[in-house]
């Protein structure tokens, strides 16, 4: 007999063909011989089966000798052997209906686990293979678990259920609640305005929660809360902000913070957390601030950076249009008795300039 796989909630067509391309008597019954539907004259008649209100047939195909039964809004319990009686012959079709659902909400925080559960008819032994949007393959039986979701797991998961060499495909949309970046670094010259942005990697109709930015300044012994805020339907409102520095926050998404001036005492790293309503756990984004200062004091020209820099970064002092250069993999460089002219202080990573500051050295008479 023919095997057909169906999806819970879906519609399936069970085909039944007669050799003669004309209207003829036909009936569909279940394995208990209860009539589901059939033909009486030119009318489609329904039997006492539980399926009858969800079963139909395509009249215009009867002339082609096709007496299919269409079952709408499939249920697991519709799994059965169905018998089509036409032209004094019986055709059997085994229908197996499967359902695949996420155990929890499909909006999950980064790091949380996802469990997919397969509903299947008794006596079946299906296998399941799921592919994440990023191309990760996971196999399982009645359950499939993804222990730690990453932001690249956001999107449509395609799961294939196999039984008796037949397959049926499920698509499940998973939204991983996370910031677009795990970490970002802002490089600024002393005195410049600093913009911090925290774009989200997802969109929700209603977004409500609360957040806080904790800051660990390089010069400070402990971290402190710089700002706390509320988020209501994508509108941001500040709850509390420190006096120094006096941060400003944008009223709309993406979350946006402005520090009026980059100063050495602010250089360091922060952690922005966002707790969403009805979700356990918090979203995190790390943000770093690196501040550069170039000064001339008496016969000494100095360039310094504060904040979290990697040891492989190079700090250089260079005289414009001249070969004179001092470079160090350090947080400060200096030149004694510098030549007059425009000097450039450069913070670079493998030749790529991250930050530069110019200082004019005037001749001393």
């Amino acid at each position: 007999k023919k095997v057909v796989l169906g999806k819970k909630g879906d519609t399936v067509e069970l085909t039944c063909n007669a050799s003669q391309k004309k209207n003829t008597q036909f009936h569909w019954k279940n394995s208990n011989q209860i009539k589901i539907l059939g033909i009486q004259g030119l009318f489609l008649t329904k039997g006492p089966s539980k399926l009858s209100d969800r079963a139909d047939s395509r009249k215009s195909l009867w002339d082609q000798g096709c007496f299919s039964m269409i079952i709408k809004n499939l249920k697991i319990e519709d799994s059965d052997t169905y018998i089509c009686e036409v032209e004094n012959k019986k055709e059997e079709v085994e229908l197996l209906v499967f359902g695949l659902t996420a155990n929890s909400d499909t909006h999950l925080l980064e790091g949380q686990s996802l469990t997919l559960t397969l509903e299947s008819p008794p006596g079946s032994s299906p296998s399941v293979k799921c592919r994440s949007p990023g191309g990760k393959n996971i196999q399982g039986g009645r359950t499939i678990s993804v222990p730690q979701l990453e932001r690249q797991d956001s999107g449509t998961w395609t799961c294939t259920v196999s039984q008796d060499q037949k397959t049926v495909e499920f698509k499940i949309d998973i939204v991983v609640l996370a910031f677009q970046k795990a970490s970002s670094t802002v490089y600024k010259k002393e005195g410049e305005q600093v913009e911090f942005s925290f774009p989200l990697a997802f969109t929700l109709e209603k977004l409500t929660g609360s957040g806080e930015l904790w800051w660990q300044a390089e010069r400070a012994s402990s971290s402190k809360s710089w700002i706390t805020f509320d988020l209501k339907n994508k509108e941001v409102s500040v709850k509390r902000v420190t006096q120094d520095p006096k941060l400003q926050m944008g009223k709309k998404l993406p979350l946006h913070l402005t520090l009026p001036q980059a100063l050495p005492q602010y250089a360091g790293s922060g952690n922005l957390t966002l707790a969403l309503e009805a979700k356990t756990g918090k979203l995190h984004q790390e943000v770093n601030l690196v501040v550069m200062r170039a000064t001339q004091f008496q016969e000494n020209l100095t360039c310094e950076v504060w904040g979290p820099t990697s040891p492989k970064l190079t700090l250089s002092l260079k005289l414009e249009n001249k070969g004179a250069t001092v470079s160090k993999q350090a947080k400060a460089v200096w030149v004694l008795n510098p030549e007059a002219g425009m000097w450039q202080c450069l913070l670079s990573d493998s030749g790529q300039v991250l930050l530069e500051s110019n200082i004019k050295v005037v001749p001393t008479w």
């Epitope: 139909d56 009249k59 215009s60 709408k72």
Partner: antibody
């Protein structure tokens, strides 16, 4: 809720090929047939043809020689191509879901054939 | 092909009136008939299927009857939103065909 969203070129020259696509969302794609119907300005409705998820088609004999209907089940989309168009093919073209009757319709695409 | 003949082609009526539209199929189609409503610039909407079954969400003032060759759509008490064009359609055999339409307009 089932939704049908259709698109395609709205202005054609005689002898060109009309090409329209319809995307189905929010419901079952298998088990149903997916139709194309047209309506010339101020006139009645004409069934063009249909396809199911496995690619089985039925077409109106009056148009069959010029009609190609195809399906892309990976995207839940189906398409219509009507070759060698003339001014008589100017109409509003609709996609629709059918079992015996047309219960969900696309928004329609006005196709004008003019030299 | 099955010919679907709709009468009248237009009808003038007032709010609260009872409106009847007929559709004749040649040859007969048992109960494989539907009625649709179409408003200007919109796609048709299914009102009645299988000759007399009311589609979900359609007001009960709409009703359908008939079998074989003669079918009727009745609007028991015409409402302002019912001014539109109505089409019948047979699902008995290919090609699927529609009636020419009946325009219900304000008297």
């Amino acid at each position: 809720q089932v939704q049908l969203q259709q698109w395609g070129a709205g202005l054609l020259k005689p002898s060109e090929t009309l090409s329209l696509t319809c995307a189905v969302s929010g419901g079952s794609f298998s088990g149903y047939y997916w139709s194309w119907i047209r309506q010339p300005p101020g006139k009645g409705l004409e069934w063009i043809g249909e396809i199911n998820h496995s690619g089985s088609t039925n077409c109106n004999p009056s148009l069959k020689s010029r009609v190609t209907i195809s399906v892309d089940t990976s995207k839940n989309q189906f398409s219509l191509k009507l070759s060698s168009v003339t001014a008589a093919d100017t109409a509003m073209y609709y996609c629709a879901r059918v079992l015996n009757f047309f219960d969900y319709w696309g928004q329609g695409t006005l196709v004008t054939v003019s030299s | 092909d099955i010919q679907m003949t709709q009468t009248p082609s237009s009808v003038s009526a007032s709010v609260g009136d009872r409106v009847t539209i007929t559709c004749r199929a040649s040859p007969g189609i048992s109960n494989w008939l539907a009625w649709y409503q179409q408003k200007p610039g919109k796609a048709p909407e299914l009102l009645i299927y299988a000759a007399s079954s009311l589609q979900s969400g359609v007001p009960s003032r709409f009703s359908g009857s008939g079998s074989g060759t003669d079918f009727t759509l009745t609007i028991s008490s015409l409402q302002p939103e019912d001014f539109a064009t109505y089409f019948c359609q047979q699902a008995n055999s290919f090609p699927l065909t529609f009636g020419g339409g009946t325009k219900v307009e304000s008297k």
